[in-house]
């Protein structure tokens, strides 16, 4: 980027620069015509017959340097070829010299500083690349010369530029004084300010553009070169904050549009809101969950919103004495999550009708909650109780939801308790064809024993047709019609209002071989 200090092409009034000495053949200000056919102010000198060593000087007005350390001067000039000038002497030149003089104010006069090298600082002797020439019988032809010179380093508030002619026929068509600066640059979302280089290269700290944050690592910097170009160098740079994405060639951060979001700073663009969420404002880092939908604390910010599952379905119970096997089907709606678990709540009602949460005597296998499989075995059920089990399905957002948790209930009533198995059977009498048996009355939990059932069969005769039954209301029985000297297996069970209890252990008895032993009482 170039910042102009002086451009004579843009001047409309007379330049009125200072010349020295005040003699004929001196630099003269004239109107000229530039490439765009605009009138410009020019200076011309054409004293090709002067005495050797005589110089014509032309000095610009005072030019403030505006912080520039090096200033560039682009000269556009034309010059006549000495060979085309028949009256030109040996002093005719095709060069001129450029000088500058620094000062802190516009203090120069017609005579000061002295018109010579030192105090003036020589910049360069400029030779024409293109000469305007005229050959007899032909039109004059020529081209404009363009030369850029570098002045400096400068340290004072301003300077004058001076031109010394020592015998050229030339016109200074325009003078452009400028300095180079690195233009404001935005790269990788980092803004580097406009910078005037003070040295060969100057480090420049960058700052993040609006809605961007520094990337990890060293703060971004670029080098501004003396020629006004930024040194090509990777920039760690910045990245757009959450809710913003890079736009316009990585030069600015644009807020995510409604319905989109960006959860993290860094690269990447705004994404549509995930399922069951929305963003009603621009610049969203996270999309809000719809009513009834949630994100678990462990869910990423960009995860879809989910809802608690519906209730499990089709609970099936299988009661086996004091044990209960429950199983069910998965809920129709999982809520959009994979972390489905089940839990059970339990209430028990006594035969009298008073109900309470289940006591600690129940055991659940694998447990009452955090079940991953759709079944459970409940043990320790008490007889003649009614149990209500509520099976709920849960997931990672169930704890965030308000309102009742849907459940599938199942009611199970246990049987009243039957008498225990009858054991301790005794043979009170034995004959070749009969056996008399007696046993202790079992302690029935639910009322008295109503009667007993005796089951017996000859040992070795295992088929169903060989088994015989005998009912008795007393805690004794006589088995008749038995074989002589045969072994029999006997079992007894008691019946109460709750029903039959289990048969007791098989008791081994044997009939007599002959009558002589007859009706002998035996103890089992």
């Amino acid at each position: 980027l170039e910042e102009t200090l002086l451009n004579t092409k843009l001047e409309t009034a007379d330049l009125k620069w200072v010349t020295f000495p005040q003699v004929d053949g001196q630099w003269e200000e004239l109107s000229g015509l530039d490439e765009e056919q605009h009138s410009v102010r020019t200076y011309e000198v054409c004293d090709v017959q002067r005495a050797p060593g005589q110089a014509h000087w032309l000095r610009t007005g005072w030019v403030p340097r505006r912080g520039a350390v090096h200033v560039y001067a682009t000269l556009r000039f034309t010059m006549l070829e000495c060979l085309s000038l028949p009256r030109a002497g040996r002093s005719c030149k095709e060069t001129f010299t450029v000088f500058y003089y620094e000062s802190d104010a516009d203090t120069a006069t017609a005579l000061t500083p002295a018109w010579m090298e030192n105090p003036y600082i020589k910049v360069d002797t400029v030779a024409a690349e293109h000469l305007t020439r005229k050959r007899p019988g032909a039109e004059a032809t020529g081209k404009v010369n363009v030369k850029t010179l570098r002045l400096g380093p400068l340290s004072k508030a301003g300077f004058y530029l001076a031109f010394q002619d020592q015998g050229a026929c030339m016109a200074l068509l325009s003078l452009h004084l400028f300095y180079k600066k690195c233009a404001q640059l935005t790269v990788n979302l980092t803004r580097f300010p406009e910078t005037v280089p003070r040295e060969l290269v100057v480090p420049v700290a960058g700052s993040c553009v609006v809605d961007a944050v520094p990337a990890p690592g060293p703060s971004p910097s670029l080098y501004c070169r003396e020629d006004g170009q930024w040194a090509e160098q990777p920039v760690t740079g910045c990245s757009c904050a959450p809710g913003f994405e890079a736009a316009e060639g990585n030069t600015k951060c644009r807020a995510c549009a409604q319905g989109t979001f960006k959860p993290l700073s860094g690269e990447g663009s705004c994404q549509p809101c995930p399922a069951n969420s929305h963003s009603n404002t621009i610049g969203s880092a996270v999309c809000q969950c719809r009513v009834g939908y949630f994100r678990a604390r462990t869910d990423p910010r960009g995860a879809p919103c989910t809802t608690p599952p519906s209730a499990p379905r089709s609970v099936v119970s299988r009661l086996n004495g004091s044990s209960l096997h429950l199983e069910w089907s998965a809920p129709l709606e999982s809520g959009g999550r994979e972390d489905l678990t089940y839990a059970l709540r339990c209430r028990e009602c006594r035969p009298g009708g008073s109900c309470a949460p289940c006591g600690g005597d129940l055991t659940f296998d694998p447990g009452p909650r955090d079940l991953v499989e759709p079944w459970v075995v409940v043990r320790g059920l008490r007889p003649d109780f009614t149990y209500t089990f509520e099976v709920t399905a849960l997931n990672g957002v169930s704890s965030l939801a308000t309102g009742p948790v849907p459940f599938e209930p199942v009611n199970v009533t246990t049987d009243r308790e039957v008498p225990p198995a009858v054991s301790d059977i005794r043979v009170t009498r034995s004959s070749p064809s009969s056996l008399s048996l007696a046993w202790a009355v079992p302690r029935a939990p639910s009322g008295a024993v109503l009667d007993y059932e005796v089951k017996y069969h000859e040992k070795g005769a295992e088929g169903p047709s060989s088994v015989r039954f005998l009912k008795t209301s007393e805690n004794r029985a006589e088995l008749r019609g038995l074989k002589r000297g045969a072994s029999y297996l006997v079992q007894v069970r008691a019946r109460s209002e709750a029903g039959y209890g289990p048969f007791g252990q098989e008791h081994h008895s044997q009939t007599q071989l002959d009558e002589s032993e007859g009706w002998r009482e035996q103890l089992a």
Partner: antibody, heavy 126, light 109 residues
């Protein structure tokens, strides 16, 4: 502002020559083109030739080639036009005119003439 | 030689009229065309050069256009002091023989 002052009216015999002068006052002379233009009574303008004093040599219209000589004296900032072998049809007002820009200060080689002398009447009569 | 042809050779117009004069070159002269105004007994005055560039001090009612072979001088609103003869001239060819057109006389209607 430059001024071009021409020499006075002349009456010439056919076959003779006439030399008209044109003195420029104020500023640069050597690098401007000085053209000579004539105008016969009741007629249009006719370009005769031009000189850029610094170069010395002049350019002429084909019609006047060999009969006209244009010169310049840089020391006095004066241009001259001499026309020989005069004929009655050479009776005209003769103007000198300076180009708008010097040979050095225009990007285009414009010969547009923005400064004119007052004119010199040359009468050729026997 | 290159020929410069102006038309019309004369025209009558009233103050305030828009007047157009054309000039045609026999060969392409790019934009190297000038327009002059001459009043009786006076030296010509440069109005326009480079086909369309208004000479310093010339009123803006004068304008020029064209390139190549066809050129136009326009006076947008004729003023009393504009009654004169107008000449075109070419700057392009060397040597510039036949430089001037024959002139267009603008008279009061």
């Amino acid at each position: 502002q430059v001024e071009l002052v021409q020499s006075g009216a002349e009456v010439k015999k056919p076959g003779s020559s006439v030399k008209v002068s044109c003195k420029a006052s104020g500023g640069t002379f050597s690098t401007y083109a000085i053209s000579w233009v004539r105008q016969a009574p009741g007629q249009g303008l006719e370009w005769m030739g031009k000189i850029i004093p610094i170069f010395g040599d002049a350019d002429y219209a084909q019609k006047f080639q060999g009969r006209v000589t244009i010169t310049a004296d840089e020391s006095t900032s004066t241009a001259y036009m001499e026309l020989s072998s005069l004929r009655s049809e050479d009776t005209a007002v003769y103007y000198c005119a300076r180009s708008s820009y010097t040979i050095l200060t225009t990007y285009y080689n414009y010969n547009a003439m923005d400064n004119w002398g007052q004119g010199t009447l040359v009468t050729v009569s026997s | 030689d290159i020929q410069m042809t102006q038309s019309p050779s004369s025209l009558s117009a009233s103050v305030g009229d828009r007047v157009t004069i054309t000039c045609r070159a026999s060969q392409n002269i790019n934009n190297f065309l000038n327009w002059y105004q001459q009043k009786p007994g006076k030296a010509p005055k440069l109005l326009i050069y480079g086909s369309s560039i208004l000479q310093s001090g010339v009123p803006s009612r004068f304008s020029g256009s064209g390139s190549g072979t066809d050129f136009t001088l326009t006076i947008s609103s004729l003023q009393p002091e504009d009654f004169a003869t107008y000449y075109c001239s070419q700057d392009h060819f060397y040597p510039p023989s036949g430089t001037f057109g024959q002139g267009t006389k603008v008279e009061i209607k």
